[in-house]
């Protein structure tokens, strides 16, 4: 008789990434009988929630339910009804909500309360909403990319999952850039981690990892821009801010109240003789780069070496996956290729920033102007952060791999978060059975 496939025994999980600028929902799927194996979980869907990040709903929390509806309804359609009640749903909020909590714990709780009430009405196993720490965000991002790259697998493969994957079992570092924070996480080479706050110990699949991680709050691309504007307006002679980080001919009016709304600009706050100012782009990469560098305090370091702002950073080691906004921005600028050197990236950024705004708008007619206008700043910021902030060099630049997806799953903290909460990363190497009998009869 012919072997006949049994109905597949699969499990699902949902993670909502409540970021500072938007919320994304990820649906994951894995074979139930293999959940302790490495690399078996994969993403089946990403649904981007229409609208801003949840922290922006603080004055309109009654709209949160509607905001989440489309992606949650999609989940009920994509996941078989019989699996709904056993499908865990997790929501992790990141730096946008960390900033709101710094302003007011009650306001942050108010938003999360309504989020939890809204999500609990769906037929899934809702496991709560929480603000994850920067350390968790870094650690779970590191776990995600190394899980997807097969770095935790004890079997050395003769094939390569992705073009840039090295066949050795050395883990990749993780570079994550969001709107409000940025994380750097990697295993340093035989280096003691001088600052306990930055040290993580993991035992995964029978191997110990001593991991360095740090999350720089306020150094995500959006908050870094607010910081830069607040710093630069201090020395403006009037309500015109000639800004090298925007294209020549670009103009935008900014409310001073919006500028000082975020805790990230508090250190630059001053009484200004105007309520609004106008950004006028002059499109000069070099000047933009110099202005950005002023956000990094490198004059003080209580350790053998630092990134910036007195934060310990061990010497960089190995390859790094750069994802989230690192990837989105560099992808837009067409700078993700392994073959593009750091010098070439800088050269292309100089050209891009110098392009007149009218020309840019014509060339990228399909892109929203709000986003389009900020690519010059974001690209320059990424270079400044990686080179001067994290001390990558022209030589070590080739060890940075700009990654969107690995094996169809987005690089980011959500998969690692779910793997951890569902206990799918065992501390010890599971005993592997020579053959799995469960699929055929």
């Amino acid at each position: 008789t012919q072997n006949k496939a049994l109905p597949e025994n699969v499990k699902y999980g949902i993670v909502l990434d409540a970021g500072s600028s938007h919320t994304s929902l990820y649906i994951y799927k894995w074979p139930a009988e293999k959940e302790n194996d490495t690399g078996v979980v994969h993403q089946v869907e990403e649904c981007r929630v229409k609208g801003p990040g949840i922290s922006k709903f603080v004055q309109k929390v009654n709209e949160i339910g509607i905001y989440l509806t489309d992606c949650m309804e999609l989940s009920t359609e994509l996941i078989p009804t019989s699996k709904h009640h056993q499908t865990p749903v997790y929501l992790g909020a990141t730096a946008g909500m960390r900033l709101l909590r710094m302003e007011s714990e009650e306001l942050a709780d108010r938003v999360l309360d309504v989020v939890e009430r809204s999500l609990s009405n769906y037929p899934f196993d809702f496991q709560g909403a929480r603000i994850i720490t920067g350390q968790e965000e870094g650690a779970y991002g590191w776990i995600t990319i190394n899980y997807l790259l097969g770095k935790f697998s004890q079997k050395t493969r003769w094939f390569s999952i992705v073009p840039y994957e090295t066949n050795n079992q050395e883990t990749f570092g993780a570079l994550d850039l969001g709107g409000a924070s940025t994380q750097v996480t990697f295993v340093p080479q035989n280096q003691t981690i001088e600052s306990p706050d930055n040290a993580l110990q993991f035992r995964l699949y029978g191997k110990d990892y001593n991991v360095y991680t740090h999350s720089f709050l306020c150094y995500g691309k959006d908050q870094a821009l607010w910081q830069k504007l607040a710093k630069d307006i201090q020395v403006a002679s009037n309500e015109i801010l000639r800004d090298p980080c925007f294209h020549p001919g670009y103009k935008k009016v900014v409310n001073v109240s919006d500028l000082y709304k975020t805790p990230c600009t508090k250190r630059f706050e001053m009484t200004l003789p105007f309520q609004q100012f106008e950004i006028q782009g002059i499109g000069n990469y070099q000047q933009c780069h110099q202005s950005i560098l002023e956000l990094f305090n490198t004059s003080y370091c209580p350790y053998s070496q630092c990134a910036f702002n007195g934060i310990f950073l061990p010497p960089l080691q190995g390859d790094f996956g750069a994802f989230s906004a690192f990837y989105f921005v560099m992808k837009f600028l067409n700078l993700t290729s392994e073959k593009v050197s750091q010098e070439k990236v800088t050269e292309m950024m100089k050209k891009f920033c110098a392009q007149p705004w009218e020309e840019i708008k014509t060339s990228y007619a399909g892109v929203k102007e709000k986003y389009l206008s900020e690519y010059c700043f974001s690209g320059t910021y990424i270079l400044s952060l990686l080179l001067q902030g994290y001390h990558f060099t022209a030589d070590s630049w080739e060890h940075i791999h700009f990654i969107g997806k690995i094996q169809g799953s987005d690089a980011g903290w959500t998969l690692g978060y779910m793997l951890n909460l569902t206990n799918m990363i065992p501390a010890e190497q599971p005993l592997s059975t020579p053959l799995s009998h469960s699929t055929y009869v």
């Epitope: 709780d109 309360d113 009430r117 609990s120």
Partner: antibody, heavy 121, light 107 residues
């Protein structure tokens, strides 16, 4: 001191609906969640759903989803629980209770006196 | 949903003695646990919240302990008015769930 006063006992036919009210006095109504909990004769406590009057946002236990509707009227500081398609198993005392801890703290600090709902043909 | 299990179902204790009631959660609820007392014909009354904090007006003989999945309510010296049914409730996640109750009766 907050007090919750519920409407009187009801006798209902199977298939019909019942709407129980819960009026708050002596404290802030809007900000704190109001939960509804029922207790069948000789049985334990069963949470049905909750609402934050300030936002009008309700959430429900899966068991009652589609059959229960919880609403609130801020102007009269009154919460309501309507249960439809009644069956004999819905015979119980229905309590409203205030979630006293503020946002995300759902301990039930103040309870109504209870409303007996009997479903019988 | 989180399942709350109470034991024993009935506890027979003499007045003046100590009573220890247990409550177990099917997954960690941190310290988001409350204890209620219910007397016949009355609404429940909050005794303990946050696993160990006494609600206002609750006598010192009532104490709560535990965190994660294992919790205990202790009544140090039972008074006649303490004979009642006691329920634990988790409020970490929706739906809010209660234990089946422990009836404390006179021995």
């Amino acid at each position: 001191q907050v007090q919750l006063v519920q409407s009187g006992a009801e006798v209902k036919k199977p298939g019909s609906s019942v709407k129980v009210s819960c009026k708050a006095s002596g404290g802030t109504f809007s900000k704190y969640g109001i939960s509804w909990v029922r207790q069948a004769p000789g049985q334990g406590l069963e949470w049905m759903g909750s609402i934050i009057p300030e936002f009008g946002i309700a959430n429900y236990a899966q068991k009652f989803q589609g059959r229960v509707t919880i609403t609130a009227d801020e102007s009269t500081s009154t919460a309501y629980m309507e249960l439809s398609s009644l069956r004999s198993e819905d015979t119980a005392v229905y309590y409203c209770a205030r979630e006293s801890g503020g946002y995300r703290d759902h301990r039930l600090g103040v309870w109504g006196q209870g409303t007996m709902v009997t479903v019988s043909s | 949903e989180i399942v709350m299990t109470q034991s024993p179902a009935t506890l027979s204790v003499s007045p003046g003695e100590r009573a220890t009631l247990s409550c177990r959660a099917s997954q960690s609820v941190g310290s988001n646990l409350a204890w209620y007392q219910q007397k016949p014909g009355q609404a429940p009354r909050l005794l303990i919240y946050g696993a160990s904090t006494r609600a206002s007006g609750i006598p010192a003989r009532f104490s709560g302990s535990g965190s994660g999945t294992e919790f205990t309510l202790t009544i140090s010296s039972l008074q006649s008015e303490d004979f009642a049914v006691y329920y634990c409730q988790q409020y970490l996640l929706w739906p809010l769930t209660f234990g089946g109750g422990t009836k404390v009766e006179i021995k």
